[in-house]
């Protein structure tokens, strides 16, 4: 059979060849002629065999972290008859290791973020570093991990590398440290080989500072002309911590609250106090108000170190305006009857200097041929009024200071012009009508209406009545509808288109105003041949052919 | 070619040790066995042994006790150590190579050094 | 170990005969491991066969050998003028490696 020993041979060895051991055979009495052969992998390349003696020999130098066994196979041969002597077998050369790899922190860079004021053993992070040689070879791959920097506020665990705070820090002094570990093979013994890591440690913030006002009083100024929601001025309060626990709210103490606001920009953490209601120097010319500033998020376990918020005086002075002439009323409306005579008085307006010289007022109607206003805001008529020309005037007056002609104010002016019955009433069109020779006593001829141009305080009523001659004359008549209409009747039974053409009728027209007044108006009736049917009709073509000039016979 | 050559002290003292170096020339000292010969004046040829280029040796039995072969591949030298010597040590030194007609199992010397001559006296 | 035995001892022949020196081995060589060496004086011994029959690189086709198990025979067909030279027999097919003692061949 076959006789050796396990094969070992010590990665890295620098010497050209290294003996291993010896394979031989138990038939192999040194008197015969046995040839030894190797196979397999690395066979005849890392590992040589003395094929006259068995001697196996390492040729390379090997690297057990490579590769650290190696399978080959042997064989034994008597060259004398040229047969195997023993069957072929498998037989491993292990590689020991030796202590030729350092630890390596593989999972570099390593960061960390902890909370600020942490307690002492709170866990940071856990580095590990990884050694390539042989676990199972002695101590090769024992780690032990140090600090190398980063005492007194770091430690870390000699075999599990975690790292654990091990005194408070504040991040308002530093936000951030560099621990760097080291890691030591062989348990830190004599030869050991080492590898280091640094690990970035960030402090993340906690809200253990309020803020606090950078001054004590702040002065500012409002201009008494400034609108509702005018800022007129920043405060501004400082916190040591970052982000959300750096965000602030700004008030006011509940006292000063009437006039004055204060809104927190977020983005800049200012406080920006806002006019709330407007000021008038003359009224109140200066303001004192108190604001306090508290952080937006305090988590309860953080409340002891915000027991009282920061607070500071704020003195706002009021600037005087030279304000513009302030009327009594926003506009005014006054009415005026037409047809008054020039000078007629309309209504008097007002205007006074609100600012503490009271400077005299003059007054102007912008863009009015028709209206006078004198110093005293008298309005007269400068012209006559006809409401049937414009019942309304929409104007401005315009109140100016004496003293500084730009500071002028202007305020709307109604004026309506009220009617009186100055019109009398009038056909509402011209009216031209036909009546057939032939018509008959009591026919409707037309039918007429009237307008005016006056307004009615009730409905208007028209009275209709044909004129003294005409009532004489007894060709036609007239009935008033009682609706503001009338019809014109033929008053006789035939009609000579030779003898008398065309009728001029005069009407009457009165109104119900008082006084009421009657116009006159004229009615042409013209006679047509309207054949046998009797209809008039049939005057409608002769109304074309006579409106056209042809004589018809 | 292939060149072989012996050096080493011709004067050896009773007792002492025997040292010679063989070097290569021409090739490598790899893959090959390499031996060491030596003739006595006026006899014939005795064989003391070989290194293979690995460091595996083998000695003639007859002198073993006494016999170190060690190889330096890095130089392409090997060399002899013969402790103990004694007037019968007395003999022309070769160093020889053996062929490799037939791998791995013992061949004939196709290649010799000229030879050198070492006295042991006193 | 293997002991060679040669004969003749001196073998005295003139230019263009024919030479036969014998070699005896004290038991049979494994796989024919058989070499023949010629040496002349202040010379290194040089390979002419091995493997029994096998001639070496160069050596010219007058020199044959021949033999197996434990007697073999080289033989120079045409002796030369330069052939006359001591020469020995060598087995390798066991350790340790044994020449014989030499046959000198001599002009006569």
């Known amino acids: 059979g076959w006789v050796w020993n396990q094969f070992f041979v010590p990665e890295e060895m620098n010497t050209t060849s290294h003996h291993i051991g010896q394979l031989r055979s138990d038939l192999d009495n040194g008197n015969n002629s046995f040839q030894y052969k190797l196979l397999g992998a690395g066979a005849g390349s890392t590992f040589i065999i003395d094929e006259r003696t068995g001697d196996i020999y390492a040729i390379q130098k090997l690297d057990r972290e490579e590769r650290s066994l190696y399978i080959l196979r042997a064989q034994v041969i008597d060259i004398a008859t040229g047969r195997a002597v023993e069957p072929e077998s498998e037989f491993v050369i292990k590689v020991s290791d030796i202590n030729d790899n350092e630890p390596k922190f593989l999972d570099e860079p390593y960061e960390a973020i902890v909370p600020e004021m942490s307690p002492e053993g709170t866990l940071v992070i856990q580095v590990t570093a990884s050694d390539a040689d042989d676990p199972s070879s002695g101590n090769n791959a024992r780690l032990l991990y140090s600090l190398l920097q980063g005492q007194p506020y770091f430690s870390v665990e000699p075999t599990t590398g975690v790292i654990r705070i091990s005194s408070k820090m504040d991040r308002e002094l530093q936000d951030e440290y560099w621990v760097i570990i080291q890691a030591k093979d062989m348990i830190g013994q004599p030869g050991a080989l080492s590898g280091t890591t640094s690990v970035l440690i960030k402090l993340s913030d906690v809200n253990d500072n309020k803020p606090i006002f950078k001054e004590s009083l702040y002065r500012l100024t409002v201009s008494e002309s400034a609108p509702t929601g005018t800022s007129i001025g920043t405060i501004m309060a400082y916190d040591n911590d970052i982000g959300e626990n750096a965000e602030m709210d700004y008030s006011i103490e509940e006292d000063d609250s009437q006039t004055f606001d204060i809104i927190t920009n977020h983005e800049t953490q200012e406080g920006i106090v806002i006019l709330k209601k407007k000021v008038d120097f003359e009224h109140q010319n200066h303001y004192g108000i108190r604001a306090k500033v508290k952080n937006h998020h305090v988590p309860e376990q953080l409340m002891k170190y915000h027991t009282e918020a920061s607070t500071t005086f704020i003195k706002i002075q009021v600037e005087d305006v030279d304000e513009p002439p302030l009327f009594l009323l926003p506009y005014y409306v006054f009415e005026v009857f037409e047809e008054t005579p020039q000078g007629s008085f309309v209504g008097v307006v007002s205007a006074t200097d609100p600012d503490n010289r009271k400077s005299p007022i003059r007054y102007s109607i912008t863009r009015s041929k028709v209206f006078n206003i004198n110093d005293n805001g008298t309005i007269t008529t400068s012209n006559s009024l006809d409401r049937e020309i414009s019942a309304w005037y929409n104007l401005s007056i315009t109140a100016t200071e004496k003293y500084n002609i730009e500071q002028i104010s202007s305020i709307p002016l109604y004026v309506q012009v009220l009617n009186i019955n100055d019109h009398a009433p009038e056909f509402s069109q011209y009216y031209e009508t036909y009546v057939c020779e032939n018509a008959g006593s009591g026919q409707v001829i037309q039918t007429i209406s009237a307008v005016d141009r006056d307004e009615s305080i009730e409905e208007h009523h028209f009275y209709f009545n044909l004129s003294v001659e005409d009532t004489n004359n007894s060709s036609f008549t007239i009935i008033d509808n009682q609706d503001n209409t009338a019809v014109i009747l033929t008053n006789r039974t035939g009609f000579n288109l030779q003898e008398e053409p065309v009728f001029y009728i005069s009407i009457l027209i009165a109104d119900n105003g008082i006084p009421s007044l009657t116009s006159t108006n004229t009615l042409t009736i013209h006679v047509c041949d309207c054949g046998d049917s009797g209809s008039t009709q049939t005057c409608q073509y002769q109304e074309l052919v006579l409106s056209m000039g042809f004589k018809t016979e | 070619q292939v060149q072989l050559q012996e050096s080493g002290p011709g004067l050896v003292k009773p007792s002492e040790t025997l040292s010679l170096t063989c070097t290569v020339s021409g090739g490598s000292i790899s893959s090959y066995y390499w031996s060491w010969i030596r003739q006595p004046p006026g006899k014939g040829l005795e064989w003391i042994g070989y290194i293979y280029y690995i460091g595996s040796t083998n000695y003639n039995p007859s002198l073993k006790s006494r016999v170190t072969i060690s190889v330096d591949t890095s130089k392409n030298q090997f060399s002899l150590k013969l402790s103990s010597v004694t007037a019968a040590d007395t003999a022309l030194y070769y160093c020889?190579?053996?062929?490799?007609?037939?791998?791995?199992?013992?061949?004939?010397?196709?290649?010799w050094g000229q030879g050198t001559m070492v006295t042991v006296s006193s | 170990d293997i002991v060679l035995t040669q004969s003749p001892g001196t073998l005295s022949l003139s230019p263009g005969e024919r030479a036969t020196l014998s070699c005896r081995a004290s038991?049979?060589?494994?796989?024919?491991?058989l070499a023949w060496y010629q040496q002349k004086p202040g010379q290194a011994p040089r390979l002419l066969i091995y493997g029994a029959s096998s001639r070496a690189t160069g050596i010219p086709d007058r020199f044959s050998g021949s033999g197996s198990g434990t007697d073999f025979t080289l033989t120079i067909s045409r002796l030369e003028p330069e052939d006359f030279a001591v020469y020995y027999c060598?087995?390798?097919?066991?350790?340790?490696?044994?020449f014989g003692q030499g046959t000198r061949l001599e002009m006569k």
């Open positions: 020889a190579r053996e062929s490799r007609y037939r791998s791995g199992w013992y061949d004939a010397f196709d290649i």
């Open positions: 038991q049979s060589v494994a796989g024919s491991y």
């Open positions: 060598q087995q390798y097919g066991k350790s340790p490696i044994t």
